[in-house]
């Protein structure tokens, strides 16, 4: 099943996707579409690249902010709304018949939490997962204890049982954090 990402209304959502150009600099077209990856191409294209640059974008809210020329084609959706929720397809269009790499990612947009996160929750999260907290858009930041959690990404590895993930996800929802579950 697709990896799930949670973002608050009004925040930026980050949906990761990447490939390794071979040889380096030999870029391939990529499309991002709303909806699970279909057999061919992308449905409901929100952004498309060619071998050089982004050449089609349905809204100014969709951006590739990573190092596109090194294969980082992660999608940033700015100022998300509830309507942005759903499955997105990142399709890396490798030349040849049926060679495309297809990645489905699920974005869940939630309403901003009204409750200020408890300090104990912050400390517990930081000590439990010291290397999994990220404060930037593009991957792990240095280990730190954040003063607040509105823009934190947390990766929960799949060895946790579903109950733990469910509980943690609900706690984070209440705290207004952003969570990635792998």
């Amino acid at each position: 099943s697709e990896v799930e990402y949670i973002a608050e209304v009004g925040q930026n959502a980050y949906l990761p996707c990447s490939y390794t150009p071979a040889p380096p600099g030999n870029l391939v077209p990529v499309c991002w579409g709303k909806g699970a990856c279909p057999v061919f191409d992308c449905s409901n294209v929100v952004l498309r690249t060619d071998n050089r640059d982004v050449n089609d974008r349905t809204s100014g809210r969709y951006w590739l902010k990573g190092d596109f020329h090194k294969g980082d084609v992660s999608l940033t959706i700015e100022n998300v709304t509830l309507a942005d929720s759903g499955v997105y397809c990142c399709r890396i269009q490798i030349p040849g018949i049926m060679n495309d790499e297809k990645h489905n990612v699920k974005l869940v947009v939630i309403k901003p939490a009204k409750v200020t996160p408890a300090p104990t929750l912050q400390r517990d999260l930081t000590s439990a997962f010291p290397r999994m907290l990220t404060t930037g858009e593009h991957g792990p930041a240095e280990t730190q204890t954040p003063g607040s959690l509105p823009d934190v990404n947390l990766t929960v590895s799949n060895f946790f049982c579903e109950l733990q993930i469910f509980t943690l996800t609900n706690e984070l929802r209440d705290s207004g954090a952003t969570i990635r579950t792998a």
Epitope: V39, S43, V87
Partner: antibody
Framework: EVQLVESGGDLVQPGGSLRLSCAAS????????MTWVRQAPGRGLEWVAN????????YYVDSVKGRFTLSRDDAKNSLYLQMNSLRAEDTAVYYC?????????WGQGTLVTVSS | ETVMTQSPATLSVSPGERATLSCRAN??????LAWYQQKPGQAPRLLIY???TRATGFPARFSGSGSGTEFTLTISSLQSEDFAVYYC?????????FGGGTKVEIK
Amino acid sequence: EVQLVESGGDLVQPGGSLRLSCAASGFTFSTYWMTWVRQAPGRGLEWVANIKQDGSAKYYVDSVKGRFTLSRDDAKNSLYLQMNSLRAEDTAVYYCARGSNWFDYWGQGTLVTVSS
Amino acid sequence: ETVMTQSPATLSVSPGERATLSCRANQNVYSNLAWYQQKPGQAPRLLIYDASTRATGFPARFSGSGSGTEFTLTISSLQSEDFAVYYCQQYNNWPLTFGGGTKVEIK
């Protein structure tokens, strides 16, 4: 107005060949995937083949692989289906349609009958 | 391949009544599903795509729902022009496949 007009259907003997054409108008042909779908008499629909915008990729259902060849001529706004080694089970109305995954415009179809 | 099963094969309905058509996939197709309407002697017309998005030219009495393996096409109040054959088609898995169709006929 989008229009797709197929031609080339005929009665042909088993083992014979036919070339179907689809003339497109009313849209920018070169920017769309194009598809052939067929429908045997009194039966349902079957996807046959499709071709990417630039012609760089073509896909075929297993039952026609190696026998049918899809091509396009963007200068003429035309789609073609070369059908060789025809079999009785290829008898159908062949529709040209616009799109890759789902098909928003269809032609009226051309009937291919394979019979001795 | 993904097998699409439509039921019932024939649906007899009086004008003004509600019609509910079912389409089932034997594996997950997410929301990558389309519905087509075909009248005798005519080409199919795209009715619904992405499981629930109505295509241009069709009124609001047509609605699609479902995801995964179970899908429904609902016609809230059948009009005379709605009597036709309806096909579902999945575009999530190779190859693209259609259901066998449901014929909606006048009761």
